[in-house]
């Protein structure tokens, strides 16, 4: 049994860990495969993830940990029975890969805005809660050709748009993903889109 | 009442062994670290030896690394310390002492909080 | 290894008067924002030590709020903000951010 491309991990900067590696032929990771990991700290003990299948030959295992903080290294194992397949260390402070954003809510009851609203990930005692920025992809269904990404760099959870700038009687999606500009992270996944239909109509004299 | 009671000690000549005790009630022995501290007589404190919760990580001060080996048994909730090719600096009086809650990924410290009531060990010939 | 180095060696005081003693890490104790890992212990005589102030500045329980513990990275210092007949012993700051476990050389508060 051999490891073909070693264990990646991204923490979430709040309690899990995510490692995911590819072995060299198919296999049972919850069966044949543990990942251990301990903290590289006094007394700390050794804990034990089981790894989840993640395509044929892929493994990954989400650790389970307390809240991050700079300092923190762990080593890892990655075990097949007694066989030692592989070894590194993970500091998870350095491999920061953002929870993604929730509740993305569209507001078309606002005027001539459309209003874009979702909540932060993490709670306010988080260092990362003060530290995200956004990316809110709006395309639609309708129109192929319509994709846009607004960056939100300010604090606040939301986007207001034109609804003019937006084609009328159409359906539209959006997403919302977030990344820690001091924190050097990965972006964060998509959240889960949501659909909206634009019905606003331009005031007759500016047609 | 969380308590420690250290046993063992006594008058052994050098080179000779001993094995000191420390049991531990009123708390979820199991959970916590233990730690070994020794006292010489009208010196201050320090530290011997400390172990992990499921006695997986040792640790061990230089003087006494190769001679003591920490151990416990959590179905006895008993911490032992055995002292093996004793010197005569090793006479002290030996405290036990619970330390860090060390079930969590990163253990959790509220100082050394008990300690035994001491047992003296003096090397003599 | 973690050198600890308590002053004064010596501490006379009148009761009801303040006391403090410094404690100086040779390295960091501070492992991540308010988590100092330096304690503080009296030792009366006769008895075990007892553990007062745990990760620079968190009272233990039972013990009277006048005594206190401040200072971060590689300075510590531990205050009675009025000193009590039965406070009189020795105190000891030692670091448990790694093994081995370092104790200051302690410090004799004696009254007056």
């Known amino acids: 049994m051999k490891v073909l491309q070693e264990p990646a991990c991204v923490s979430d900067y709040m309690s899990i860990s995510t490692c995911e590696w590819k072995m060299g032929g198919p296999t049972n990771c919850s069966a044949e495969l543990r990942l251990l990991y301990q903290l590289v700290f006094q007394s700390s003990e050794t804990h034990t993830c089981v790894p989840e299948n993640n395509g044929g030959v892929g493994c990954v295992c989400h650790l389970l940990m307390d809240d991050v903080v700079s300092m923190d290294n762990y080593t890892l194992d990655l075990w097949a029975g007694q066989q030692l397949l592989w070894k590194g260390s993970f500091k998870p402070s350095e491999h920061v890969k953002p929870r993604a954003p929730g509740n993305l809510t569209v507001h078309t009851n606002v005027s001539d805005t459309v209003l874009l609203t979702w909540s932060n990930p993490y709670p306010p005692d988080n260092y990362l809660y003060n530290d995200l920025t956004y990316a809110v992809n709006i395309w639609s269904e309708n129109d192929p050709a319509y994709s846009r990404i607004h960056n939100v760099t300010y604090l606040k959870p939301t986007l207001r748009i034109p609804a003019s700038t937006l084609k009328s009687g159409i359906s539209y999606r959006a997403r919302v993903r977030a990344w820690a500009q001091h924190y050097n992270t990965t972006w964060s996944e998509w959240s889960p889109s949501t659909k909206w239909y634009n019905s606003y109509r331009e005031p007759f004299e500016q047609r | 009442e969380v308590q420690l009671v250290e046993s063992g000690g006594g008058l052994e000549q050098p080179g000779g062994s001993l094995r000191l005790s420390c049991a531990g009630s009123g708390f979820t022995f199991t959970d916590f670290a233990m730690t070994w501290v020794r006292q010489a007589p009208g010196k201050g404190l320090e530290w011997v030896s400390s172990?992990?919760?499921?006695?997986?990580?040792?640790y061990y001060a230089d003087s006494v690394k190769g001679r003591f080996t920490i151990s416990r048994d959590n179905s006895k909730n008993t911490l032992y310390l055995q002292m093996n090719s004793l010197r005569a600096e090793d006479t002290a009086v030996y405290y036990c002492?619970?330390?860090?809650?060390?079930?969590?990924?990163?253990?959790?410290?509220?100082?050394?909080?008990?300690w035994g009531q001491g047992t003296t060990v003096t090397v003599s010939s | 290894d973690i050198v600890m180095t308590q002053s004064p060696l010596s501490l006379p005081v009148t009761p009801g008067e303040p006391a403090s003693i410094s404690c100086t890490a040779s390295q960091s104790l501070l492992y991540s924002i308010g988590y100092n890992y330096v304690d503080w212990y009296l030792q009366k005589s006769g008895q075990s030590p007892q553990l007062l102030i745990y990760l620079g500045n968190k009272r233990a329980s039972g013990v009277p709020d006048r005594f206190s513990g401040s200072g971060s990275g590689t300075d510590f210092t531990l205050k009675i903000s009025r000193v009590e007949a039965e406070d009189v012993g020795f105190y000891y700051c030692?670091?448990?951010?790694?093994?081995?476990?370092?104790f200051g050389q302690g410090t004799k508060l004696e009254i007056k």
């Open positions: 002492a619970k330390d860090r809650l060390s079930v969590t990924v990163r253990p959790r410290y509220y100082g050394l909080d008990v």
């Open positions: 030692m670091q448990s951010l790694t093994s081995p476990y370092t």
């Open positions: 172990i992990s919760g499921s006695g997986g990580n040792k």
